[in-house]
Interface confidence: medium
């Protein structure tokens, strides 16, 4: 039999059959089932859900479904000593206390085990002191405070608004500024869309709503006690003092009602400009400390959370490939939630469930994919991507030899405006071709393709008539596969029309109000956007697992490499004198990019012409495509970030959610004019150019004719 016959038992079983089997009604039903109680990582409820999913995936027809457990460091509030923040007067009396929990949403008043808002992995502590308002606590916000305004955060408690960047970066920045505590709050400017009511009457954040979340700076390490290795039964665990990425100062999140009480008394310096003002009726004074009559009052934090080694469970399902069973296409998304997980993660988990069901239906009718598909329900994503990272650490040797692609499947929606895709350039053409074949769910685009509505609503900033596809950053379970192992990765979801607020999430993110009703009433009553996301994610997996030649186009990598080289060169050229003084040249990088472009072009020509009926040549060409992403991995990793090993992309050092291109060079150049030792600083720039140029050249050579 030809390989084509082996994977297509009957002509019916093509991509269309798979897509037609996906049903919005099923996704709705699965979402309801997954959101009736909390599924916090490390709890019995989440273990029971893991077993339910294992059982259902078996029923759907997967070849095997196993639980993979690990014992990792998690963090929980102390049930008998709640966390809170108070304002104390000169006698030490608490004259105001923040709320201990969110008012439960209608219908959920009697649900037990709703974890109160907390910042996971905060150390215990009861610091007291003056408050300093630090805007979003970004690198540039602290530059403004320390350098321009000369406000010293040392020994102060800082209050920062959520949004723009990952909360862990905020805490890291505050620590570096010398703060002794951090209060995080949701400002209505970022979490209350004008003209929309707050939950339960709309999708906005009420004043008592609070965003939970971890505040780690793991840089891809996984379990803080076992970096680089799986947290299995015989693991050697670091002491807590040596744990990776734990914050050193107490941190706690609050809602905007409580934030109002803290911010309204602020004195000291006025906000430097309008970008520091939110939407509360407060002056947004920076401080330090309270104004006039209140100047003797202080803020005190009471944090009693504990870190505990706890068992977590991934569900791993396998659908064996008929022709290349040793080539893995992975679809993974997490199962654990902060509370009900109406959007994060269960809108994604419900889609994965329906994709598994559709693949299982085809398999029961005699079909198999060409390559093996692995399905994963990850645990403890909210605690630092722990489930996915530990599994990848345990299986790293298999994955680096056999991993074709990883498609992530967290929240299917963060809005209902248009598609959002972040992926490796290798997948650009796959995504374009697939979305041209899918129908748009958008109003006003009836009968039009998803590609058309997506391109209209989210155009590429570079290429006319094409949609925007973003760089992969982090903050989700693709991280270990892409940034550490170099497996081609992608993610897709429906998003909002909120380009200026890219990283603030949707208003009810990680709050108790993220319920089934939120989705069913306000975001996607017909579940048509969920269905579209299922078609995109499932369609990508289908093509990656079933196409004879892998649907990767290496020429798209060549295009972005040139763009990224131009960008980093222009950043460096802001310092022409130093580049001259220290003999900094980008010639080697541009030469490597040129070579990559030429070799990729020739490879693509050979890809059109080779004999696809020769299984050895086919496998050889596919391996060159599969291993291209791997070729961008530097085994030594990035400076001080050994688990971020991709030379072309890494999470930004200033915002884990965002991707940065040529991150080694970028970080070496960042704020270089402030470096005391310019010779050393520019020497590091030169070293990073060398690493990048070598890596691009080495990757290019993997695409050359093998002999």
């Amino acid at each position: 039999k030809s390989s084509n016959e082996a994977t297509n038992i009957t002509p019916k079983h093509n991509m269309k059959a798979f897509l037609d089997e996906l049903k919005a009604e099923n996704i709705k039903k699965f979402l309801y089932n997954f959101t009736q109680i909390p599924h916090l990582a490390g709890t019995e409820q989440n273990f029971q859900l893991a077993k339910q999913i294992q059982s259902q995936w078996k029923e759907f027809g997967l070849d095997s479904v196993e639980l993979a457990h690990y014992d990792v460091l998690l963090s929980y509030p102390n049930k008998t000593h709640p966390n809170y923040i108070s304002i104390i007067n000169e006698d030490g009396n608490e004259i105001f206390n923040t709320s201990l929990f969110e008012p439960p949403p209608p219908g959920y008043e009697n649900v037990s085990d709703i974890v109160p808002p907390f910042s996971a992995f905060s150390p215990q502590g009861m610091p007291e002191g003056d408050l300093v308002y630090v805007n979003y606590a970004r690198t540039e916000d602290f530059f403004k405070l320390e350098r321009d305004m000369k406000i010293n955060c040392s020994g102060k408690i800082v209050i920062a608004r959520y949004g723009k960047v990952f909360r862990g970066n905020k805490v890291k920045n505050a620590q570096l500024a010398g703060a002794k505590g951090v209060i995080l709050y949701s400002d209505p400017a970022d979490y209350f869309a004008p003209g929309v009511k707050s939950y339960p009457d709309g999708w906005n954040l009420p004043g008592g709503g609070v965003q939970r979340g971890n505040i780690l700076n793991l840089n891809g390490a996984g379990d803080p006690l076992t970096p680089g290795y799986p947290a299995n039964e015989y693991a050697y665990r670091r002491g807590i003092a040596e744990a990776v990425g734990l914050p050193s100062i107490p941190v706690h999140p609050i809602g905007y009602y409580d934030a109002q009480k803290l911010l309204e008394k602020m004195g000291g310096s006025a906000p430097p400009d309008s970008s520091w003002r939110g939407s509360l009726k407060v002056p947004y004074n920076v401080g330090p400390g309270f104004t006039g009559n209140f100047s003797t009052q202080k803020v005190k934090m009471h944090i009693h959370s504990t870190n505990e080694v706890t068992r977590i469970y991934n569900v791993i399902g396998t659908l064996r490939g008929a022709v290349e069973p040793d080539r893995y296409v992975i679809l993974g998304g997490h199962r654990d939630s902060w509370v009900f997980g109406g959007i994060d993660p269960q809108s994604g988990a419900a889609v994965v469930h329906e994709i598994v069901r559709s693949f299982g239906t085809l398999k029961k009718e005699g079909w198999r994919p060409r390559r093996t598909i692995l399905f994963a329900s990850w645990d403890a994503e909210e605690f630092g991507l722990l489930g996915s990272t530990e599994w990848a650490e345990e299986n790293s040797r298999l994955l680096q030899e056999r991993g074709v692609a990883y498609i992530n499947a967290d929240s299917s929606i963060e809005g209902n405006y248009t598609l959002r895709v972040d992926c490796t350039p290798l997948m650009y053409s796959l995504v374009h071709n697939l979305t041209k074949e899918l129908k748009s769910p958008d109003e006003g685009f009836e009968g039009k393709s998803l590609y058309e509505s997506w391109t209209k609503k989210s155009p590429s900033p570079e290429f006319s008539g094409m949609p925007r596809i973003s760089k992969l950053g982090s903050g989700n379970d693709f991280e270990v596969f892409f940034q550490r192992l170099g497996i081609a990765s992608g993610r897709a979801r429906y998003t909002k029309n909120w380009e200026t607020n890219k990283f603030s999430g949707y208003p009810l993110y990680h709050s108790v109000y993220e319920t089934y009703e939120l989705v069913e009433k306000f975001y996607d009553p017909m579940f048509k956007y969920h269905l579209t996301v299922a078609q995109v994610r499932g369609g990508m997996v289908f093509e990656l697992a079933n196409s004879i030649v892998l649907p990767f186009d290496c020429r798209d990598y060549a295009v972005v490499l040139r763009k990224y080289a131009d960008k980093i060169y222009s950043i460096s050229m802001k310092h022409p004198q130093e580049m001259k003084t220290y003999s900094v040249s980008f010639d080697s990088l541009f030469s490597a990019v040129k070579n990559f472009t030429e070799i990729a072009s020739k490879f693509s020509e050979r890809l059109q012409d080779f004999d696809k009926s020769n299984p050895i040549v086919l496998r050889m060409m596919n391996d060159q495509l599969m291993f291209l992403e791997r070729a961008f991995i530097d085994p030594l990793g990035l400076p001080d970030r050994p688990f971020y090993r991709h030379v072309i992309y890494a999470p930004s050092s200033h915002n884990k959610y965002a991707g940065e291109s040529f991150p080694g060079i970028y970080d070496a150049l960042f704020d270089i004019e402030s470096k005391v030792d310019p010779s050393k600083a520019w020497g590091e720039v030169k070293r990073q150019i060398y690493v990048a140029a070598f890596t691009v050249q080495a990757a290019a050579e993997t695409l050359s004719e093998v002999a």
Epitope: K574, P576, Q577
Partner: antibody, heavy 116, light 107 residues
Framework: EVKLVESGGGLVQPGGSLKLSCAAS????????MNWVRQASGKGLEWVAE??????????HYAESVKGRFTISRDDSKNTVYLQMNSLRTEDTAVYYC???????WGQGTTVTVSS | NIVMTQSPSSVSASVGDRVTITCKAS??????VSWYQQKPGTAPKMLIY???NRFTGVPSRFSGSGSATDFILTINNLQPEDFATYYC?????????FGQGTKVEIK
Amino acid sequence: EVKLVESGGGLVQPGGSLKLSCAASGFTFSNYWMNWVRQASGKGLEWVAEIRSQSNNFATHYAESVKGRFTISRDDSKNTVYLQMNSLRTEDTAVYYCTRRWNNFWGQGTTVTVSS
Amino acid sequence: NIVMTQSPSSVSASVGDRVTITCKASENVGTYVSWYQQKPGTAPKMLIYGASNRFTGVPSRFSGSGSATDFILTINNLQPEDFATYYCGQSYTFPYTFGQGTKVEIK
């Protein structure tokens, strides 16, 4: 090679004025914050003033002892930083050094003497 | 203002000796401390920045340590060209301030 060359020092009477200049070369001057630091004869170092780069809105900061009397400014087109000193006092007598941010590079200094 | 207090104010030593100079800040300055060497009639030169990092071209016999409020400059195997006055300085907050200096003299 980074080079800072001060000029404009001299003898002036109390209450008089003087303008010091510092010509910079060997680095992208416009990116860097610049400082003036002074040293009275046989005494220690005293920071006087700082001016930030354009990206920091040319923000200026002064020691309490000179605030309201001295003005630091820069001309990026000429790679030069200035210190305009008014209402000079005898205690302002010192060698004035121009330094680059964090005081990692220093000029050779120019002497200011305030005496009647 | 943050006061930087150096000790001793002077030290007599011989070539080959090990010399230790301490600098105490009146409040926490993190690691925003630099050390400078000044010879008579010349401008100061940076030796150490960020409390412990040797500046370009500075010999390895010079080392710095400390954080928060207590800082140390150590000169191992003192050389004839090392006889000079040494200053610590903080750039943590305005006004930038310096220690009063430590003179290293020939014994």
